[in-house]
Interface confidence: low
């Protein structure tokens, strides 16, 4: 377990190589979760990009967080997608948060502390627990299958995941630095495996 | 700018087909889903039918009132898009509207609507 | 399905009045609703989405809110290019049900 306080991966170079992959300790599938994480790329109006991809053995698209260029973000559960369109792409370290839960099917997507309107994917799914998570890189089979067209190029850090879904008030608190404890993958007790070129830097954004 | 072109409406039997068309132009057909909305002369406006994009395996989506009978589909090579309308009722009858999704792919607001093409069931 | 119940089925109002239309949701739709008018001949326009927000070239004279499962649209000030029809339409979920529509006659 590595403390990454105030460190981020950089992916330095488009490639269908790079990448990092986390252990996370799930025992039991997942009704709900939250994802939390930054990110700071060139790439918005460029190309899409991975920017968080967990994968079973029975779909590769188990959760994706995906940026679609001239669209916005791409949010998949179980292989089915939703799309939360941003107009305008600008250059700067991004915070985003996303969850979902099971029950309703529900959906929260926030950017930089900003919640977008509440959307339905899946409900009823559930989330499988023996997963390859990876950052970089979009899985299109488990654990592997890249393409370098996908590829994130700039950094990430902060990736946070809970089991549950978070409230606005601990998505705020989280967006604004304070204390928290996820119980899935947690970035000051990580567990992970670098792969070909990526490097650990300082973090840019506050 | 988003151009949606319907073709192939008409008169129709009772218990007849059709099938009507649209074409899309001025936006990346293939990455949005795409639905018909139909509206029957002085009444409202009924969603009918969805398919989305090739990455959501195309599923489609019916209403209750044309499930088994009308099936919708896409060309993506063509920027086509396609419903067929089966066993018609006078019911059926509606300018129908070919409309695409906004920028989300299950559940959405339709900020693009083609002129539509009229449908006319009658013996 | 989410039933969409719009009021008034009808209004007859004058150039330069507000005018506010309703639309309640049979459940909880989490602001997944847009606001379209129709003029006469001519297809549905899309004005709101996602309950409060303007879609590209709309005026600020109309806005959206929302209060639980009601929603409204507001048109201050109205132009004689605003009469038509408006029909709000919810997008949670499947089948996107629309209203029964408000027809928005000249006084």
């Known amino acids: 377990q590595t403390d990454m306080s105030r460190k981020a991966f950089v992916f330095p170079k488009e490639s269908d190589t790079s990448y990092v992959s986390l252990k996370a300790p799930l025992t039991k599938p997942l009704k709900a979760f939250t994802v939390c994480l930054h990110f700071y790329t060139e790439l918005s109006s460029t190309r899409g990009y991975s920017i968080f991809s967990y994968a079973t053995k029975r779909q590769d698209n188990e959760i994706l967080i995906f940026w679609s260029k001239d669209i916005g973000y791409s949010f998949t559960v179980g292989g089915s997608e939703i799309l939360f369109e941003v107009p305008e792409v600008t250059v700067a370290p991004v915070h985003i948060c996303t969850s979902w839960e099971s029950a309703s099917g529900i959906v929260e997507f926030w950017v930089d502390g900003k919640p977008r309107v509440r959307k339905s994917l899946k409900k009823g799914y559930t989330v499988g627990a023996e997963a390859s998570i990876i950052l970089g890189q979009e899985q299109d089979s488990f654990g592997g299958n890249f393409e370098g067209s996908q590829s994130l190029v700039g950094d990430i850090g902060n990736v946070n995941m809970w089991d549950f879904v978070l409230s606005p008030d601990e998505i705020n608190t989280i967006y604004l630095g304070g204390p928290f404890s996820p119980n899935v993958l947690n970035w000051r007790a990580l567990k992970y495996e670098v792969q070909g070129e990526v490097f650990t830097k300082p973090q840019l954004w506050p | 700018e988003v151009q949606l072109e319907e073709s192939g409406g008409g008169l129709v039997q009772p218990k007849g087909s059709l099938k009507l068309s649209c074409a899309a132009s001025?936006?990346?057909?293939?990455?949005?889903?795409m639905n018909w909305v139909r509206q029957a002369p002085g009444k409202g406006l009924e969603w009918v039918a969805l398919i989305r994009s090739k990455s959501n395996n195309y599923e489609t989506n019916y209403a209750d009132s044309v499930k088994d009978r009308f099936s919708i589909s896409r060309d993506d090579s063509e920027n086509m898009l396609y419903l067929q309308m089966n066993n018609l009722k006078s019911e059926d009858s509606a300018m129908y509207y070919c409309?695409?999704?906004?920028?989300?792919?299950?559940?959405?607001?339709?900020?693009?609507w083609g002129q539509g093409t009229l449908v006319t069931v009658s013996a | 399905d989410i039933v969409m119940t719009q009021s008034p089925a009808s209004l007859s109002v004058s150039v330069g009045e507000t005018v506010t239309i309703t639309c309640r949701a049979s459940?909880?739709?989490?602001?997944?609703l847009a606001w379209y008018q129709q003029k006469q001949g001519n297809s549905p326009q899309l004005l709101v989405y996602?309950?409060?927000n303007l879609a590209d070239g709309v005026p600020s004279r109309f806005s959206g809110s929302v209060s639980g499962t009601q929603y409204s649209l507001k048109i201050n000030s109205l132009q004689s290019e605003d009469f038509g029809i408006y029909y709000c339409?919810?997008?949670?979920?499947?089948?996107?049900?629309f209203g029964g529509g408000t027809k928005l006659e000249i006084k």
């Open positions: 339409q919810h997008f949670w979920g499947s089948p996107p049900t």
């Open positions: 459940e909880n739709i989490y602001s997944n």
């Open positions: 996602a309950a409060t």
């Open positions: 409309v695409r999704h906004g920028a989300v792919v299950e559940g959405a607001w339709f900020p693009y």
């Open positions: 001025g936006f990346s057909f293939n990455t949005y889903a």
